[in-house]
């Protein structure tokens, strides 16, 4: 199956050229997507190419600039946010990245009614998070770990919390582990639908052990970065949820929301908060042993001025075969009655599907079913539910958007995207306006990405928002590799793989094989998406075959595959990569003396273990920023899949699954180990320990560190990294430079 954009065949083959590494490093063939910034049922904002902020009205067809590029430039703004009453815009500048999602910035408020910046009671700097209320123009922001509220942009602020302290107490923003492994956001505060209440989380990191690493910078002495970071089994943050009435916040003060008794009895996490109405809120909690989740619906009691979370409104989700949920526990999408909701969780056959919960989870009505998985609920209106799944044609690596009519009985299902641009588009996401009056579809491939606007009632395409014409033209004279997505059936396990083949691929010839692996729990590498990246170059120019394989532990193919790795990370993921390689060799076009494997992060862990498997399959391999022992990684992530590193739990497998334990087995492979010294996520410690074990075992290996670089190895390091890895692979495969 060739999953590539069709183009007119050029008879003059010599005008076609292969991809170069420079193309990749320069981002020559990057694509654009168009996500409307919806501000009503029929209006959206978009930042034009020349940086004007333009308001589009779909129904009138009119558009006008609400904020000029001149105003944006006057404060060097890189982002903006319109207040819901459309009177003010915040402009964001001085962006300074912290962790994966978090950053600080300077904010200016621009008054659209008089065309001036708001003077007096300006916002402090730098701010950690800022957002408008959902109605009007109240502002909530976090500064120095404390939350502040402004009734109007020009008003003085009201300080809601006072105990915020760097690396100790976090109000309204997550600490490191909650940001990375639980919330996946830079914020931990949530406005109620009409802005009456503001809910926020307080994270107490006082007792968490600190990871410290050197940041070399340019000074005479390096500085030390300290992050409260709970590794597996360590003390975790203590979380509390508060809600404050924003009309008169000085009166009652923040009210703590009670934790369900069955959760509070031992260590626990808060996992998400969903407002239902202004006076009803839904909180999700998770036991530290992450197989029990509780969804708690709480109501505001006006007479008591308190939040009441009755036991009758607690819904328990438990997994007996693995952990609760997929990567995260899913969040509920409430229906119009403000008490029943739709939620994705495993059905009795072990596939994640949409369920409708009216009273108890036990009485849940299953909305979707089949040997495929529902992946995301986008929107529930009074008569429709929009969701994505990988049902169509039984390809787990696809995403199509479906509509279920919930207003009629029996509910009818329609695939909105399956036949729109079938060859070009098999992997979609969507963005809906208020009441799903309109929506944008963003197609990521396998062909060149395209974004389109649709009528929410008829699903009719209204217009193309972005079709990447320039990219299409630029690719016309490029010899792109061929891609195929197929499956292997091995011992009752289905292994889906993507193979990237050189442009002039000939099955009768032998090619070097590079396995690219991630393999982390609930991940998916084999997806029908467009990409022109490093491995595209390796196939196009260097004539390598590249394969990606989704083995046990990966997502969207049912719980049997997903939970197979529960409590034994580092075993089946590696086995399945090896099994796939053996199958690829059997196909006859792989040079079995030239097989390599590489991966980053979890993929670096898997590639290291595969190289040290003792199979003799791999000639060489690369691990970028690998985990080397699960005792070194974050508690929230690690314990979800591995339990605790204690004698009475799973310490034995923690010890058995380290890369260091296999140091001897690296003797017969060429190993390139790479890590950034300022990696806040997978600490440099991981690679330092691998290197130490290899030295102690007197095993030769290659290594590269990137000073002051984090887990992403960005900027100039990226160029150096890919150039270095290219040289390493070409040398391994005896390819001339």
């Amino acid at each position: 199956i060739v999953l590539r954009p069709s183009r007119v065949h050029n008879s003059e083959e010599n005008t076609m050229r292969a991809l170069t590494l420079k193309d990749i490093l320069n981002g020559t063939f990057s694509y654009k997507t168009f996500f409307p910034n919806w501000i009503s049922g029929q209006e959206y904002l978009h930042q034009s190419a020349d940086n004007n902020i333009v308001l589009y009205n779909i129904e009138t067809g009119q558009s006008y600039t609400i904020l000029s590029n001149r105003t944006m430039k006057s404060v060097n703004a890189s982002n903006y946010g319109l207040s819901p009453d459309r009177q003010f815009v915040y402009l964001e500048s001085d962006y300074s990245k912290l962790w994966r999602y978090s950053y600080t910035a300077t904010y200016y408020i621009y008054d659209l009614s008089n065309g001036e910046f708001v003077r007096g009671n300006e916002l402090p700097r730098p701010i950690q998070y800022l957002c408008w209320s959902p109605v009007g123009s109240k502002l909530a922001y976090v500064y120095q770990n404390n939350i502040y509220l402004k009734q109007r942009p020009g008003d003085p602020p009201f300080q809601i919390t006072f105990n915020g302290r760097e690396n100790k107490i976090f109000n309204g923003i997550p600490d490191w582990v909650y940001e990375e492994e639980m919330l996946a956001t830079k914020y931990a505060l949530w406005w109620s639908p009409n802005g009456k209440f503001l809910a926020y989380a307080e994270f107490n990191d006082t007792d968490i052990p600190v990871i410290a690493y050197s940041y070399y910078g340019d000074e005479q002495y390096p500085r030390t970065i300290n992050i409260p970071y709970p590794k597996a089994g360590a003390k975790n943050p203590v979380v509390r949820i508060f809600i404050i009435d924003t009309t008169y916040p000085a009166y009652v003060g923040p009210q703590e929301v009670p934790v369900p008794a069955m959760i509070a009895s031992s260590d626990y996490y808060f996992s998400w908060l969903t407002w239902v109405t202004d006076e009803r809120v839904c909180l999700q909690w998770l036991k530290r042993v992450q197989n029990v989740s509780v969804l708690s619906i709480c109501d505001f009691r006006e007479d008591w001025q308190t939040w009441d979370c009755p036991k009758t409104q607690e819904h328990i989700e438990e997994s007996r075969t693995g952990w609760a949920g997929g990567f995260f526990v899913s969040t509920p999408v409430f229906s119009y009655d403000a008490i029943s909701y739709y939620k994705i969780f495993s059905d009795k056959d072990g596939y994640k599907h949409i369920h409708y919960i009216k009273d108890t989870v036990e009485n849940a009505i299953q909305i979707t079913s089949g040997k495929w998985e529902a992946i995301n609920i986008f929107r529930v209106t009074q008569d429709s539910l929009f969701y994505s799944s990988n049902e169509f044609e039984e390809y787990p690596g696809r995403r199509n958007i479906y509509r279920i009519s919930i207003g009629s009985y029996p509910p009818s299902k329609k695939c909105v995207t399956c036949h729109l641009r079938k060859e070009r588009c098999q992997y979609y996401t969507a963005s809906f306006s208020d009441y799903a009056k309109y929506y944008a579809l963003v197609c990521y491939g396998p062909g060149i990405p395209i974004s389109t606007l649709h009528d929410g009632r008829t699903d009719q395409e209204i217009k193309i928002l972005e079709e990447n014409k320039e990219l299409e033209n630029a690719l016309k004279n490029i010899q792109l590799p061929k891609e195929e997505i197929k499956k292997l059936e091995v011992d009752e396990i289905t292994l889906w793989y993507k193979m990237i083949l050189p442009p002039q691929f000939d099955r009768s010839k032998k090619y070097p094989l590079l396995i690219q692996v991630y393999g982390g729990p609930c991940s998916q590498s084999v997806r029908s998406v467009f990409a022109v990246n490093w491995i595209s170059y390796l196939a196009s120019k260097e004539g390598m075959v590249i394969a990606l394989v989704d083995g046990r532990g990966t997502a969207f193919q049912g719980d049997k595959l997903l939970y197979a790795v529960y409590r034994k990370l580092g075993v089946y993921e590696v086995e399945d990569q090896i099994t796939a390689v053996r199958k690829f060799i059997e196909m006859g076009f792989i040079d079995e003396k030239r097989i390599a494997i590489w991966g980053w992060s979890y993929g670096g862990y898997v590639s290291s273990l595969a190289l040290a498997s003792g199979t003799g399959l791999f000639k060489c391999g690369i691990a970028v920023a690998p985990v080397s022992s699960w005792e070194y990684y974050a508690s929230v992530y690690t314990e979800r899949f591995m339990g605790l590193p204690t004698k009475d739990d799973n310490l034995e497998h923690y010890k058995n699954s380290t890369v260091m334990a296999r140091a001897e087995y690296f003797r017969n492979v060429d190993y390139l180990l790479i890590h950034g010294t300022a990696d806040d996520n997978v600490h440099f410690q991981n690679s330092a320990q691998i290197a130490k074990a290899l030295v102690n075992a007197q095993v030769d290996f290659q290594a590269m560190w990137y000073s002051d670089q984090n887990h992403g190895l960005s900027g100039l390091s990226t160029n150096h990294l890919y150039t270095h890895m290219t040289h390493f692979l070409k040398q391994c495969f005896s390819l001339s430079d």
Epitope: F158, Y251, G253, E256
Partner: antibody, heavy 116, light 108 residues
Framework: EVQLLESGGGLVQPGGSLRLSCAAS????????MSWVRQAPGKGLEWVSA???????YYADSVKGRFTISRDNSKNTLYLQMNSLRAQDTAVYYC??????????WGQGTLVTVSS | EIVLTQSPGTLSLSPGERATLSCRAS???????LAWYQQKPGQAPRLLII???TRATGIPDRFSGSGSGTDFTLTISRLEPEDFAVYYC?????????FGQGTKVEIK
């Protein structure tokens, strides 16, 4: 009907201690922030301290380190432990319902006299 | 801390007359955090106005509040005999919350 009843006031020497209590009824005490406000003889009102429903405490600079506010939600009672008392702490002490403002219910007050 | 200055210190008026009490803040106060109280001799204060202009529960409509920023006003449209007392403005914008020194409304 909401009622706040202070007790524990009296005459104390400078440097001495007193513990004021405020018994609350007629509302869900455990859900509300509560404050102590004082009024020196013939003078205006001065906020002293507050405590959230969840127990976080706030103090005026003039009493910080000497006074401790606390609550026992099971007994519906608010306390103010006053140590190292000074002459300028002489006042009628009111317990009030609220955190930093909108004090909608007040007790009748208890007089604290600090004198040698 | 925010200093609230009330004026006049004393207001001598007759029943039935209109009383206008002023409260000036040393720095800007958002309307949501400005309250007014009434206190009679030997009694605890009583909440009159919240959010600068909203009457508290059970407060007669002859009491009204207005203002924003640094200048706030309490108006009693027609003084009743029971209205003669000391009136305090109070801000809850910042810690510590502070009260004005009070305006005494006395019978002329």
């Amino acid at each position: 009907e909401v009622q706040l009843l202070e007790s524990g006031g009296g005459l104390v020497q400078p440097g001495g201690s007193l513990r004021l209590s405020c018994a609350a009824s007629g509302f869900t005490f455990s859900s509300h922030a509560m404050s102590w406000v004082r009024q020196a003889p013939g003078k205006g009102l001065e906020w002293v301290s507050a405590i959230w429903a969840s127990g976080e405490q706030y103090y005026a600079d003039s009493v910080k380190g000497r006074f401790t506010i606390s609550r026992d939600n099971s007994k519906n009672t608010l306390y103010l432990q006053m140590n190292s008392l000074r002459a300028q702490d002489t006042a009628v002490y009111y317990c009030a319902k609220g955190w930093l403002g909108n004090f909608d219910y007040w007790g009748q007050g208890t007089l604290v006299t600090v004198s040698s | 801390e925010i200093v609230l200055t009330q004026s006049p210190g004393t207001l001598s008026l007759s029943p039935g007359e209109r009383a206008t009490l002023s409260c000036r803040a040393s720095q800007s106060v958002s309307r949501s955090y400005l309250a007014w109280y009434q206190q009679k001799p030997g009694q605890a204060p009583r909440l009159l106005i919240i959010g600068a202009s909203t009457r508290a529960t059970g407060i007669p409509d002859r009491f009204s509040g207005s203002g924003s920023g640094t200048d706030f006003t309490l108006t009693i449209s027609r003084l009743e005999p029971e209205d003669f007392a000391v009136y305090y403005c109070q801000q809850g914008q910042v810690i510590p919350p502070t009260f004005g020194q009070g305006t005494k409304v006395e019978i002329k």
